[in-house]
């Protein structure tokens, strides 16, 4: 039940961070235009991945789509690259994790395969987390860069004088949404990762199996277990003559698929 | 250089209608209206991508005032509903080159007068 849970949450908080993923990389608030020296505007800027947009102080806002490829910095090409392998990463990973779900039936699939997607879906969405935060991240390094860089010019103009022209930009709500996304993803494979160990089949120890001769009290005991129990030196079957009594080892079981939780 | 010559501006009734034209000589990226009430600074009312035809209007004229436009005549219209005293203005005809943002504006009709009086 609480491997169940733990799966079930897990593949809810993904989904949650997988949707945020997307929804942070479709944003065009990723850096904003910084109002502290100036917050009465004419206009007000901010850019995203994808384009930048002008709000007029009417309300009026007009985007413009960053037609070059070449032409754009190195870095935005790896924030984007990152964001879209998080994103198709933690996409693969939901479907893989829907299949993985416990509480769903899909003809006789063994519990070891539904372990094992799980963990491959747990992994995808650790890989995508760390992706977006990554690509959030470096984002934000840019800008703290080109912030203080900016910061400096207006500062320090021709022969000391105050320029105030530059636009400085500062983070923007997308990156917040970017993080806390990222962050939901990571727990979440996480999680799923935990309910992996829950739902796979622990090493059963087959024990050895006792026949009774119908005349004599013969015990055949098959040594070949030896690597999976890590018992005696029992290499050849050897006739065990005990008169019939068994040891604990020894009592007859069959393994079931409720050995294991 | 692209002329506008706007028409339709008058007196009319609080509650009333009018339609504003706007006929540019040639094909531009965005045109747009903007209104002047007397002793105040330029407003920005309403405005059409003459490509793909979206369209923005003021929080103040919105389910009241549409903007329309006919490409094959490089024509652009306001028609006004519901006209409040708080409309009355000088409502000039602007189109951009490659923008729609009023720094970008690259040309500016001569203005028609609005007045909306009982």
């Known amino acids: 039940m609480a491997v169940t849970a733990c799966q079930g949450l897990g593949f809810v908080v993904s989904l949650i961070g997988i949707a945020g993923i997307i929804a942070a990389t479709c944003m065009d608030q990723w850096s904003t235009q910084d109002l502290y020296n100036n917050p009465v505007t004419a206009v007000f800027n901010y850019q995203g991945l994808w384009r930048s947009c002008v709000r007029e102080s009417s309300g009026f806002t007009e985007c413009r789509g960053y037609f070059t490829l070449l032409g754009l910095p190195a870095m935005l090409q790896a924030v984007r690259a990152l964001m879209i392998v998080g994103i198709v990463l933690g996409a693969i990973g939901l479907l893989v994790s829907i299949f993985a779900l416990k509480c769903i039936r899909i003809g006789s699939m063994e519990d070891s395969a539904k372990a094992n997607m799980t963990l491959t879906s747990g992994i995808m969405f650790i890989v995508s987390g760390l992706c977006a935060i990554a690509g959030v991240s470096v984002f934000a390094n840019m800008l703290v860069t080109n912030f203080w860089m900016s910061t400096a010019n207006m500062y320090t103009g021709m022969g000391g004088m105050v320029q105030t022209v530059q636009t400085r930009y500062t983070f923007g709500a997308a990156l917040f949404v970017g993080w806390v996304a990222g962050g939901l993803t990571l727990i979440g494979g996480v999680m799923m990762c935990i309910a992996c160990r829950g739902l796979a089949p622990e090493e059963t120890n087959y024990k050895a199996v006792s026949y009774h001769a119908s005349g004599h009290s013969v015990a055949y005991k098959p040594g070949g277990f030896k690597a999976s129990t890590g018992f005696g030196s029992n290499t050849k079957n050897k006739k065990i003559y005990d008169g019939g009594a068994r040891t604990e080892d020894e009592v007859q079981s069959y393994p079931s698929k409720h050995d294991y939780v | 250089q692209v002329q506008l010559d706007e028409s339709g501006g008058g007196l009319v009734q609080p509650g009333g209608s009018l339609r504003l034209s706007c006929a540019a000589s040639r094909s531009t990226y965005c045109m747009g209206w903007f209104r002047q009430a007397p002793g105040k600074g330029l407003e920005r009312v309403a405005n059409?991508?003459?490509?793909?035809?979206?369209?923005w209007l003021a929080d103040s004229v919105k389910g009241r005032f549409t903007i329309s436009r006919d490409n094959s005549k490089n024509t652009l219209y306001l028609q006004m509903t519901s006209l409040r005293a708080e409309d009355t203005a000088v409502y000039y005809c602007?189109?951009?080159?490659?923008?729609?943002?009023?720094?970008?504006?690259?040309?500016w009709g001569q203005g028609t007068l609005v007045t909306v009086s009982s």
């Open positions: 602007a189109a951009g080159r490659s923008s729609c943002l009023e720094a970008s504006i690259s040309y």
């Open positions: 059409v991508y003459m490509r793909n035809g979206d369209t």
